[in-house]
Amino acid sequence: MMTGTIETTGNISAEKGGSIILQCHLSSTTAQVTQVNWEQQDQLLAICNADLGWHISPSFKDRVAPGPGLGLTLQSLTVNDTGEYFCIYHTYPDGAYTGRIFLEVLESSVAEHGARFQIP
């Protein structure tokens, strides 16, 4: 029986050209994590294998950094990076747990403008 739950950073926004950390955390299970896959829509960004470490997609090698922990850092963000990201925790004996994060990448001016008119 799968008792675990995935906590994520939820819906997040970041500025174009900046960087963001995608984080998931698996709790409420004693299952062993064998591999964590990070996916963007249907594209595999990175793998962290318990024995064999991090592997980054060649398409994202220059913009994706492993960590912190089992998280993923996206750098040099573009508006095209807006969308859903998934962390898939493969565990034994439970199976796979999936967490979802929605990232919105804002134009610099929009982000600044939004910040200027925020209501405290």
Partner: antibody, heavy 117, light 106 residues
Framework: EVQLVQSGAEVKKPGASVKVSCKAS????????IYWVRQAPGQRLEIMGR????????YYVDKFKNRVTITRDTSASTAYMELSSLRSEDTAVYYC??????????WGQGTLVTVSS | DIQLTQSPSFLSASVGDRVTITCKGS??????LVWYQQKPGKAPKLLIY???NLQSGVPSRFSGSGSGTEYTLTISSLQPEDFATYYC????????FGQGTKVEIK
Amino acid sequence: EVQLVQSGAEVKKPGASVKVSCKASGYTFTEYSIYWVRQAPGQRLEIMGRIDPKNGRTYYVDKFKNRVTITRDTSASTAYMELSSLRSEDTAVYYCARIYGFYFDFWGQGTLVTVSS
Amino acid sequence: DIQLTQSPSFLSASVGDRVTITCKGSQNVNKYLVWYQQKPGKAPKLLIYNTDNLQSGVPSRFSGSGSGTEYTLTISSLQPEDFATYYCYQYNNGFTFGQGTKVEIK
């Protein structure tokens, strides 16, 4: 053209060690991890471990953690795999392979290691 | 880790035959499946990656398909140089290979 050229066949006695080399050419050696994979007679391909040539960091599969050592010499664009405390079941063809993202795109020609008393 | 089982383990065929090899995962492979060809005394050669992407330089008679736990490699018209052993490999959970399918001359 990418090439991985391995050292020649070895015959070893049980309890001994063997060191196999893998010389890379045709690409920047430090840009791709090198894996060591073995194939015993009648068995499936089995991953042993990995080295990141850029920083020398190694990763080993649990089964081999205590007996395998992977190293590299960046000046010679060469990776090495040493397996100790050899036993008859280590008789296999040992391959080095370059990993491109998540799968192996180029392999060495293989090195047959025979363990026999 | 996902276990991969290939079928058949041995296959006898003639030049010109259409050949299909199946690779079944113990769990969902999520299309992260690769096919290799290996000839005796030679290194494995990458044929297909991510289920259906043909590696550069590989003849178009090779094709791959599948989803979930079941994947196939098809050779549309077997050529003399295709007699070899074929392996599937997955990286969705762990990095594992199938046991191989040997394609022999009938």
